[in-house]
């Protein structure tokens, strides 16, 4: 009957974990004597080449200095503990502590058994490191030129993790890796980038990461924040300002980042009916005169700049009774 | 401690068959294979074949299949290596040995010296 | 069969010398090969085994090397006691065979 040894193709270990990489020789078969177990990374330098061996009578032995006696144990094979008690070496699991970059590699797992001879099976350990993963807006101020709004970073992964945004926005990424403090690991920044404008501010853009380690993707929400001056329009205008009205109410509504720190109501002919007071954000007109035949100009400022809106006023002479909704304001 | 004892010294004419003895103790003898080697004066050695007391199994190096019986009797511990039709060049020292890892525990070596 | 040529067949050296026995498979053995060491009238003695694991108790003057085809043992210091007849073996496949041997000479 033949034996094999059933090894795992691929081992993923954590950087600076355990990692136990499963070698056995199926199917226990009588007779058949295991006289040596070795590990071996065929891809070493030559002094290296050598990692583990079991011998029957010796127990484990570790030669290489990399990964060394100190992080490698044999997690079931027993030697023989007297003359009259067999060694069991059919389970060569080997575990593998304080996981390096430089451990990553091919493993083989050898037995040498009589009568059949020597049999190996082979196994790829990947080393790879679970990033930790941030984002954050930037505070940018609106220009014409592309700005970066956001950054999203994920630090000292194994493989690079890779990262991508969703949104509705008009964008581009723009991505840089650099080595991780850690020996072998990546760092990953991604700048979100647009062109900031007032439309920008406020609105949630999401970074996602992905890696091997993940159960399932980083989505990481980021809030933009740009400063942009006020943007600005101006309500309460019905089309029904006739003369003697008294209820009439003009709002100046702001968009703005920061939040406005002045208001000013003009009007563009330079006279400013008597009737109209000025309160911050509003106009409260007491009684409605020929002189509210105008264009009435609301101008914001805040930490950033300036911004206006006009409001064309016709004043009727007689309620507009067709069809007029209730006053603004 | 394992101990492998052989039979004495042996004086044979060519054409007839000798047989070895190697007594086994300090261990279970069922679970260990026993290896038959030998030696040629001044020579290197050269592997006959093993017994597998446990089930009687036995595995022979080709050269010597047609020629060479191994067997075991797990009732004294004692495993037999009987040789025929013994030529010149059969001329040797004959060792029973425990394959721990290595040939690690060996017999004292039985001294087969085959001439007319 | 695998056959395994040992050289030099004889070696002279001095006490305090470096020496090398070499072994070369005639086809790939992994690592697996067993130094030994037989001192006259004895049976021979295990000094390395998976070509370069030195054996509980040898010296550490003793040490094996390669894999594949070609495997070495070297004794870095030569003493006295170490006049022997020094045999490579292949335990990779079935039936185990074993170097022609080098003996050992202290000059």
């Known amino acids: 009957q033949d034996v094999r040894v059933q090894v795992l193709p691929e081992v993923r270990g954590q950087l600076g974990g355990t990692v136990e990489l499963p070698c056995h020789l199926l199917p226990p078969v009588p007779g058949l004597y295991i006289s040596l177990v070795t590990w071996q990374r065929p891809d070493a330098p030559a002094n290296h080449q050598n990692v583990a061996a079991f011998h029957p009578k010796m127990g484990p032995s570790f030669p290489s200095p990399k990964p060394g006696s100190e992080r490698l144990s044999f997690v079931s094979a027993k030697q023989s503990t007297g003359q009259d008690t067999e060694a069991e070496l059919q389970d060569a699991t080997l575990a593998l502590h304080g996981l390096t970059v430089e451990d990553e590699g091919n493993y083989t797992c050898e037995f040498a058994t009589f009568p059949k001879g020597s049999v190996r099976g082979m196994t790829w350990l990947r080393v790879i490191a679970k990033p930790k993963n941030q984002a954050e807006a930037q505070k940018v101020t609106f220009s014409q030129d592309p700005t970066t709004v956001a950054l999203c970073i994920s630090k000292e992964g194994r493989p690079p993790a890779r990262i991508s945004w969703l949104s509705s926005l008009d964008w581009e990424a723009k991505e840089t890796q650099v080595s991780g403090t850690l020996a072998g690991t990546v760092t990953v920044t991604s700048r979100f980038t647009l062109v900031p404008s007032g439309r920008a501010d406020g609105v949630t853009v999401t970074c996602k990461v992905e890696h091997e380690s993940f159960e399932e993707p980083a989505l990481i929400p980021v809030t933009l924040s740009v400063r942009y001056p006020p943007e600005v329009s101006i309500s309460g205008y019905d089309d029904n300002w006739y003369l003697g009205r008294t209820d009439a109410t003009l709002s100046c509504d702001v968009r703005s980042n920061p939040e406005p720190t002045g208001y000013d109501w003009s009007t563009t002919s330079g006279t400013f009916p008597t009737s109209a007071v000025a309160q911050g954000s509003q106009l409260v007109i007491h009684a409605v005169d020929s002189l509210f035949n105008t264009t009435f100009v609301c101008t914001v400022t805040n930490a950033v700049g300036m911004g206006r809106a006009e409001q064309v006023i016709f004043v009727r002479e007689t309620p507009n009774t067709a069809g007029a909704g209730a006053t603004g304001g | 401690e394992v101990q492998l004892v052989q039979s004495g010294a042996e004086v044979k004419k060519p054409g007839s068959s000798v047989k070895v003895s190697c007594k086994a103790s300090?261990?279970?003898?069922?679970?260990?294979?026993i290896h038959w080697v030998r030696q040629p004066p001044g020579k290197g050695l050269e592997w006959i074949g093993a017994?597998?007391?446990?089930?009687?199994?036995?595995n022979y190096n080709q050269k010597f299949k047609a020629r060479a019986t191994i067997t075991a009797v797990t009732s004294t511990s004692t495993a037999y290596m009987e040789l025929s039709s013994l030529r010149s060049e059969d001329t040797a020292v004959y060792y029973c040995?425990?394959?721990?890892?290595?040939?690690?525990?060996w017999g004292q070596g039985t001294t087969v010296t085959v001439s007319s | 069969d695998i056959v395994m040529t040992q050289s030099p067949s004889t070696l002279s050296a001095s006490v305090g010398d470096r020496v090398s026995v070499t072994c070369k498979a005639s086809q790939n053995v992994g690592i697996n090969v067993v130094w030994y060491q037989q001192k006259p009238g004895q049976p021979p003695k295990t000094l390395i085994y998976?070509?370069?694991y030195r054996y509980s108790g040898v010296p550490d003057r003793f040490t094996g090397s390669g894999s594949g085809t070609d495997f070495t043992l070297t004794i870095s210091s030569l003493q006295a006691e170490d006049l022997a007849e020094y045999f490579c073996q292949q335990y990779n496949t079935n039936p185990f065979t074993f170097g022609q041997g080098t003996k050992l000479e202290i000059k």
């Open positions: 017994v597998y007391p446990g089930n009687s199994d036995s």
């Open positions: 998976s070509a370069s």
């Open positions: 040995t425990k394959l721990v890892g290595t040939f690690d525990y």
């Open positions: 300090g261990y279970i003898f069922t679970s260990y294979w």
